[in-house]
């Protein structure tokens, strides 16, 4: 069964900078990746970026740079302009769409214990419930 992993990390040098890494583990070629925060897109979450393997990327503030890392993984750099750091308690969700297999999505957040600059381990949280 395909899976999606989500990893959120805080940059060591800039505590206001975060990076979300997402990857797809499974067969099929990825047609589209949607990244959102505050929950899944369509379920109260806000879209941050949409990445297409051929047509490029679209991103919305506070997303700074969305890019493909491999054919099945992406990264999204975020700039937190606020004094406090709301990203630290935020859920980030990634949805990978593969044709004709379908879509898989997962959410993750910065682990509370993680030190700045240390890469948080992948924390996949498969979305199985409709009321998230």
């Amino acid at each position: 069964t395909p899976e999606v992993w989500v990893q959120v990390q805080m940059e060591a040098t800039e505590l206001s900078s975060f990076t979300v890494h997402c990857g797809f583990l499974g067969p099929g070629s990825i047609s589209l990746v949607t990244v959102s925060w505050g929950g899944p897109d369509g379920a109260g979450g806000t879209k941050l970026a949409v990445l297409h393997p051929e047509l490029g990327t679209r991103q919305w503030a506070p997303a700074r740079q969305a890019r493909w890392e491999t054919q099945s993984s992406i990264s999204l750099a975020l700039e937190d302009s606020g004094a406090s750091s709301p990203f630290a308690n935020t859920t980030f969700c990634c949805k990978f769409a593969s044709f004709p297999e379908g879509s898989w999505e997962s959410c993750g957040s910065l682990p509370p214990s993680s030190d700045p600059g240390l890469s948080a381990p992948p924390t996949p949280v498969p979305i199985l419930r409709a009321d998230l």
């Epitope: 099929g28 070629s29 047609s31 589209l32 899944p40 897109d41 369509g42 379920a43 949409v50 297409h52 051929e54 047509l55 949805k95 769409a97 593969s98 044709f99 004709p100 297999e101 379908g102 879509s103 999505e105 979305i127 199985l128 419930r129 409709a130």
Partner: antibody
Framework: DVQLVESGGGLVKLGGSLKLSCVAS????????MSWIRQTPEKRLELVAA????????YYLDTVKGRFTISRDIAKNTLHLQMSSLKSEDTALYYC?????????????WGQGTSVTVSS | SIVMTQTPKFLLVSAGDRVTITCKAS??????VAWYQQKPGQSPKLLMY???NRFTGVPDRFTGSGYGTDFTFTINTVQAEDLAVYFC?????????FGGGTKLEIK
């Protein structure tokens, strides 16, 4: 303007074969996923076969696996559905459709359909 | 495969009425739901994608909502030209599946 025009339907004997074609125009055919959808006499819609824009990944409805083959000819902007060992339950109106990545794979354009009747 | 249960099967309404069609998925399909309109003698036409996004040229009297398993399609102020069969469809997991359709008739 995006256009999809199907042809090749007709009356065929039980166990016979038929090849449906769909000529696409108004868009870059090679960049889109395509599919064949049929509408049964009861007006139910079923996705019969689909092909990724990479022409590698395909999908077939369980009941047509091993009997139907979806393919495309990029040079001729044409989608095909080769149907063999036809059964009475294959009687339907067959549509070709384009899938849009940015619309969650919704089928944003459909052809006018071609009718297939399998008789005993 | 995911079953899309669409209700009602038939709707008889007057022009100007508000119409609601529901679609229930047998498991979560996220927001990967589309709605199509099929007028008599025509092929289906895309109306809504990602539940609530209107396709190009679709009037704003058509709206959609829902997430997960429960979806609603609404026509505010039905017009005579809305006479058609409406289908929901999920594209979350292969095989893509359609609802059974709702036939809208105008009094």
């Amino acid at each position: 303007d995006v256009q999809l025009v199907e042809s090749g339907g007709g009356l065929v004997k039980l166990g016979g074969s038929l090849k449906l074609s769909c000529v696409a125009s108004g868009f870059t055919f090679s960049s889109y996923h395509m599919s064949w959808i049929r509408q049964t006499p009861e007006k139910r819609l079923e996705l019969v076969a689909a092909i990724n824009s990479n022409d590698i990944n395909t999908y077939y409805l369980d009941t047509v696996k091993g009997r139907f083959t979806i393919s495309r000819d990029i040079a001729k902007n044409t989608l095909h559905l080769q149907m063999s060992s036809l059964k009475s339950e294959d009687t339907a109106l067959y549509y070709c459709a384009r899938h849009e990545d940015y619309y969650g794979f919704a089928m944003d354009y459909w052809g006018q359909g071609t009718s297939v009747t399998v008789s005993s | 495969s995911i079953v899309m249960t669409q209700t009602p099967k038939f709707l008889l309404v007057s022009a100007g009425d508000r119409v609601t069609i529901t679609c229930k998925a047998s498991q979560s399909v996220s927001n990967d739901v589309a709605w199509y309109q099929q007028k008599p003698g025509q092929s289906p036409k895309l109306l809504m994608y990602y539940v609530s996004n209107r396709f190009t040229g679709v009037p704003d009297r058509f709206t959609g909502s829902g997430y997960g398993t429960d979806f609603t399609f609404t026509i505010n102020t039905v017009q005579a030209e809305d006479l058609a069969v409406y289908f929901c469809q999920q594209a979350y997991r292969s095989p893509w599946t359609f609802g059974g359709g709702t036939k809208l008739e105008i009094k």
